[in-house]
Amino acid sequence: KSPIFGPEEVNSVEGNSVSITCYYPPTSVNRHTRKYWCRQGARGGCITLISSEGYVSSKYAGRANLTNFPENGTFVVNIAQLSQDDSGRYKCGLGINSRGLSFDVSLEVSQGPGLLNDTKVYTVDLGRTVTINCPFKTENAQKRKSLYKQIGLYPVLVIDSSGYVNPNYTGRIRLDIQGTGQLLFSVVINQLRLSDAGQYLCQAGDDSNSNKKNADLQVLKPEPELVYEDLRGSVTFHCALGPEVANVAKFLCRQSSGENCDVVVNTLGKRAPAFEGRILLNPQDKDGSFSVVITGLRKEDAGRYLCGAHSDGQLQEGSPIQAWQLFVNEESTIPRSPTVVKGVAGGSVAVLCPYNRKESKSIKYWCLWEGAQNGRCPLLVDSEGWVKAQYEGRLSLLEEPGNGTFTVILNQLTSRDAGFYWCLTNGDTLWRTTVEIKIIEGEPNLKVPGNVTAVLGETLKVPCHFPCKFSSYEKYWCKWNNTGCQALPSQDEGPSKAFVNCDENSRLVSLTLNLVTRADEGWYWCGVKQGHFYGETAAVYVAVEERKAAGSRDVSLAKADAAPDEKVLDSGFREIENKAIQDPRLFAEEKAVADTRDQADGSRASVDSGSSEEQGGSSR
């Protein structure tokens, strides 16, 4: 007895598609062995039509695919544009066709369900609109026009020209009689339901001279598109529902039990709490299409998703829909990285961002997720030397440690910095990851003066006090600029006296600027690192002024603010609004993030739309 299992019989209609799932025991060998779909011949052989190794028979070219889902122990054969020639006996199996690890499937493709002569077949997707055309002769032009549905043996009136509408169709059907020149009336049914499928009869006149036309309406429930993404990665759902619903509220929902479909996000501003910080709904195009990006995929995100359009912003009977079945691969290529990073007010965080190591030359970005409207993610910094104006001096994106990870350092933290941030590149869009920054109680570990003023031509010494917990770390000073932080020479001045309960392992490391020039003005950071992994940093702004009195300046900690004042964005700060910068390439298959700059405030394009692992901010 074969352990392979599937449907023993599949019945369909010409022109339609089938999706055949075959189950196998998910042993290591089975998961990786060849999967095939073959047609049984009269003399016992089985001719391969498609296999997991890329073979596709000419009979199936352009209309079939085979997808393996090793996690589930299934593979799926999709066959489109069925014809009666496809009827026959098939096998789905593993290994070699003749070896017996297979399951017999009978596929029967019929012309259509018992169609009467002269029957017009209408095949329409669930939730869409159908127009049934009914011709008539001149003698029936003034007579009653009607549409009936065959229920069992009896025709039931659906609509007629005297104004009757069957209650099952209220609000979604109309009967149009064309101008006098055209001997035709049509019945338009919107928001099609599965229950609308069946045989219809349209009629002009009621006597023996009436004109009749048969119609067969097939309402197709969309087969879910199978999507297979990595744990911790990202997925993009592209939803194209057609221009007829361009002005209707859109939604993405996830099917739970039964017929329930819980809204994940919609254009009316609803968003499920589980997706906070990791979802964006891209504003729709004129044709009503939109896309939804979800990052930081979790095991529990797997399931069936529907996108649709309905004024309520949620699934209702008759909503046009598209469906996906999302599988989340736990054998992920995306490495674990902290999903929560903690820092203290006045302190700093160093965030590690994974990217596809095959794309080391891609541009790296970091953006701040904003939940307003449908979610948006304005860029804050990139690896090409651009930093959003409000973050100058306190934000840096470093290519280190490299080989699939870059680092983002943010210091001078305030409570306003708490939130969700996305790491992304202009390469593989599946590698978008999310990190939440939390601001917790506490004091910064590194102690530096507040703002410092240097005098032209003189020497300036700026101290940085490192507590003993960083005794094994490399300590450095650097000068911040848009492209990073250039290391500077510094002097170890021995143990620091700035810490209570801290032994000889605490350190005072000073930055010395000799013969200060105007070019020395700017932001300086002191920090700790271990190899290419960065820990805490502290920032000091050095202003340069004309000489007032001779001598060198040695800045002491006493003159420093214990923690920098919280910076409040001035009222002139202008958000990048949805309408300001739109770049659909930032979703899905984008290859480059738009290099749009807003001269007014140095803003840049944004990734726009209308139980965590945790990491402290102090070290790797």
Partner: nanobody
């Protein structure tokens, strides 16, 4: 969820036939995958047959032990699923349960965990 009521069970001689019916309430019955399971005294519930319709195509599944003898079918207009049982054997004696699996039917149709609505069951006894 849908409510399910089975009927058609009874006592039959080996080699005989029975037709079980399962009537479902719920507007969107047609979008559910429907299955039949059985449970003999002292044994685990086992998969018998399943059927799934997506508006255009029908998929039928059955267990090896009933292949060629039992046929599952559905009538969406009547919200009913049937199990035609021919060539019955004494080992077919069990309580037969109808079950409904909400869309999508991507999960294994043989797994009872993928069904969220169950009937009360109807008893089939096959005497030798």
């Amino acid at each position: 969820q849908v409510q399910l009521v089975e009927s058609g069970g009874g006592l039959v001689q080996a080699g005989g036939s029975l037709r079980l019916s399962c009537a479902a309430s719920g507007r969107t019955f047609s979008s559910y995958a429907m299955g039949w399971f059985r449970q003999a005294p002292g044994k685990e519930r086992e998969f018998v047959a399943a059927i799934h319709w997506n508006g255009a195509s029908t998929y039928r599944y059955s267990a090896d032990s009933v292949k060629g003898r039992f046929t599952i079918s559905r009538d969406n207009a009547k919200n009913t699923v049937y199990l035609q049982m021919n060539s019955l054997k004494p080992e077919d004696t069990a309580a037969y349960y109808c079950a409904a699996s909400p869309p999508p039917t991507v999960g294994d149709v043989r797994d009872p965990a993928n069904y969220d609505s169950w009937g009360q069951g109807t008893l089939v006894t096959v005497s030798s």
